[in-house]
């Protein structure tokens, strides 16, 4: 219906992947739909099959090449189309002239590890994955620590306004189990959004030394 809501949203991971979500109120779950990508200045084009992720939304990943290959630049425009099968024909449902570096969402940071842990502090490092060299140092991070008896949503956000792939957590409680997550965002792009959160890293602070006030 024309007064329903349809939405087609895509993000570029800055290297070789465009992830898309198509949502349409009232659409049949078994509808067969695809996303087609046609760059304006490249020889290749790409298609992915939209698969259901909820009652009224579908998702797919356009794999443009090897994970670390730089398949698009800031001057590229990629025409993205949602096509759904209606009987014997394919019908165009949505179109977007997509500027990849205005619509960025990087991969979640990886390789989280505890560099050093003490009774009240812990130094953690991580790496960014499949991030374009174009960003140089123009990235920011958010981190959060899960304390016992709390939820992730309650955890205060720590902001790192520069490309700093480590953090020193302080004022921790001795002999306590924590979890830590981090996410990344380029400074570039009008519609750029945060990466997914990293896989949580579990760590435990050291117990306080007996008879000492640490």
């Amino acid at each position: 219906a024309v007064n329903g809501t349809s939405q087609f949203t895509c993000f570029y991971n800055s290297r070789a992947n465009i992830s898309c979500v198509w949502s349409q109120d009232g659409a049949l779950q078994d509808t067969s739909c695809q996303v087609h990508a046609w760059p304006d200045r490249r020889r290749w084009n790409q298609t992915c099959e939209l698969l259901p992720v909820s009652q009224a939304s579908w998702a797919c990943n356009l794999i443009l090449g090897a994970p670390d290959s730089q398949k698009l630049t800031t001057v590229d425009i990629v025409t993205l189309r949602v096509l759904c099968r209606e009987g014997v024909r394919w019908r165009v449902m949505a179109i977007q002239d997509f500027k990849p570096f205005e619509n960025l969402r990087l991969m979640a940071p990886i390789s989280l590890q505890v560099v050093h842990v003490e009774t009240h502090r812990c130094n953690i490092s991580w790496e960014i994955s499949q991030a374009s060299h174009y960003f140089e140092r123009h990235l920011e991070f958010e981190a959060r620590t899960l304390s016992p008896g709390h939820t992730w949503e309650e955890a205060p956000l720590l902001t790192l306004k520069q490309k700093q792939e480590w953090i020193c957590l302080e004022t921790l409680t001795p002999d306590t189990q924590y979890e830590f997550q981090v996410r990344v965002k380029p400074l570039q792009g009008e519609f750029t959004t945060w990466s997914p959160w990293s896989q949580p890293l579990a760590f435990r602070t050291k117990p306080a030394a007996l008879g000492k006030d640490t």
Partner: nanobody, 125 residues
């Protein structure tokens, strides 16, 4: 904010042509996708056609495909709807609308956030 003003409507005989214009001011027009909708008396508003900000892509309702053409002139902040081979069932008030920032061009009203006041098109048999 985007202000949209339609013009070019009127009375035309079946088989004739009209060109509607949608003049925009406000938000950066050159990066805004624009759609055309229409509403006939006693009917719901329906999607007609749309064009992306770059003019690379257009989308049409089945009922107008091959007869209507949507184009734009960013230097003039204007989108056009060229309507040929008009039929009495094309009689309606025609509206242009701006696609929400960051949204794609689709056929549903919810993706559009700013609307013109409309221009009447009447096709006589």
């Amino acid at each position: 904010q985007v202000q949209l003003v339609e013009s070019g409507g009127g009375l035309v005989q079946a088989g004739g042509s009209l060109r509607l214009s949608c003049a925009a001011s406000g938000r950066t027009f050159s990066t805004t996708d624009v759609g055309w909708f229409r509403q006939a008396p006693g009917k719901e508003r329906e999607f007609v056609a749309a064009i992306t900000w770059s003019s690379h892509s257009t989308l049409y309702a089945d009922s107008v495909e091959g007869r209507f053409t949507v184009t734009r002139e960013n230097a003039k902040n204007t989108v056009y709807l060229q309507m040929n081979s008009l039929k009495p069932e094309d009689t309606a008030v025609y509206y242009c609308a701006a696609v929400r920032r960051g949204w794609a061009v689709v056929r549903t009203e919810g993706a559009y956030d700013f609307w013109g006041q409309g221009t009447q098109v009447t096709v006589s048999a």
